[in-house]
């Protein structure tokens, strides 16, 4: 990882300090949270297995407007090796299940400390 | 209020199998981790696994091969069993609750523990 | 796995000192260590976690600092209630595993 999705950095970003950033990210909206996050916004749920980070930012890139999750957004394009636009699926979509944006902060949250606790960052 | 509370053997033979049950109050098993902790007599703490919020486990990988973790949320209950049981694995046996809602993890409500003696 | 190192293993100490211990880690944890206190006979109590937030009900004479590899556990003025051992804890990586304890006993 050069770069995590737009975040100045003198060099490359160790995986494991990439992905410690994203999990603390994510605690921090969870910790957050007052009113419904994202206005209560419905995004598709993804299969957590490989590729989910691309497939993860698919999802939350479908929410417009919501401040809480844009640094989410450019932490996971930093994980992602393709450019990812709204609109755009892949097939880690479980695509007849919607899910509240916070629960699948803290749905990717879990599965992402239990990847960081096994030392797995790529 | 959270409360956590172990209950099993006191005393296994070695080579037996020990089976542990963590009763919990006060919080859902499906939005807190559980965690397993023993402590031999005057030593220190060893971590032994956990039960996480989905249902899911992870193991210290030392003990890996002799331990399960399951669960009955109906029940509030998290199991611990330990095979092929060992002198040196008498200790004092400790769940926890997780604190969650952090990115480490760390135990903040421990139940009262039991000792549990491995002798023939 | 990451080792943890207290020192001293054990100091006397008279109510009303500053108490200060410390905790050594084998790698890098960041910031995610824990301090727990526990008396005989009875479980651990957590103190602190991610290396100074303090536990609710906690005594504000407990604090935590550091970062990286090094952390420090300190008791701003001893109380009789304090004698016990301590430990410390890293939350980083999977084993999770604790310092060797630290036993604070009355001079």
């Known amino acids: 990882l050069t770069c995590l999705g737009g975040f100045a950095s003198p060099g490359p970003v160790p995986p494991s300090t990439a992905l410690r950033e994203l999990i603390e990210e994510l605690v921090n909206i969870t910790q957050n949270q007052k009113a419904p996050l994202c206005n209560g916004s419905m995004v598709w749920s993804i299969n957590l297995t490989a590729g989910m980070y691309c497939a993860a930012l698919e999802s939350l890139i479908n929410v417009s407007g919501c401040s809480a999750i844009e640094k989410t957004q450019r932490m996971l394009s930093g994980f992602c090796p393709h450019k990812v636009s709204a609109g755009q699926f892949s097939s880690l979509h479980v695509r007849d299940t919607k899910i509240e944006v916070a629960q699948f902060v803290k749905d990717l949250l879990l599965h992402l400390k239990k990847l960081f606790r096994e030392g797995q960052f790529n | 209020q959270v409360t956590l509370k172990e209950s099993g053997p006191v005393l296994v033979k070695p080579t037996e199998t020990l089976t542990l049950t963590c009763t919990v109050s006060?919080?859902?098993?499906?939005?807190?981790?559980v965690q397993w902790i023993r402590q031999p007599p005057g030593k220190a703490l060893e971590w032994l696994g956990v039960m996480w919020s989905d249902g899911d486990t992870s193991f210290n990988s030392v003990l890996k091969s002799r331990l399960t973790i399951s669960r009955d949320t109906s029940k509030s209950q998290v199991v611990l069993t330990m095979t092929n049981m060992d002198p040196v694995d008498t200790a004092t046996y400790y769940c926890?609750?997780?604190?969650?809602?952090?990115?480490?993890?760390?135990?903040?409500?421990w139940g009262q523990g039991t000792l549990v003696t491995v002798s023939s | 796995d990451i080792q943890m190192t207290q020192s001293p293993s054990s100091l006397s100490a008279s109510v009303g000192d500053r108490v200060t211990i410390t905790c050594l880690a084998s790698?890098?944890?960041?910031?995610?260590l824990a301090w727990y206190q526990q008396k005989p006979g009875k479980a651990p109590k957590l103190l602190i976690y991610h290396t100074s937030r303090l536990q609710d009900g906690v005594p504000s004479r407990f604090s935590g600092s550091g970062s990286g590899t090094d952390f420090t556990l300190t008791i701003s003025s001893l109380q009789p209630e304090d004698f016990a051992t301590y430990y410390c804890?890293?939350?980083?990586?999977?084993?999770?595993?604790f310092g060797g304890g630290t036993k604070v006993e009355i001079k």
């Open positions: 790698e890098d944890i960041s910031n995610y």
């Open positions: 926890a609750r997780d604190g969650t809602i952090a990115a480490m993890d760390y135990f903040d409500y």
């Open positions: 804890q890293q939350g980083y990586r999977f084993p999770l595993t």
């Open positions: 006060g919080f859902s098993l499906t939005n807190y981790h």
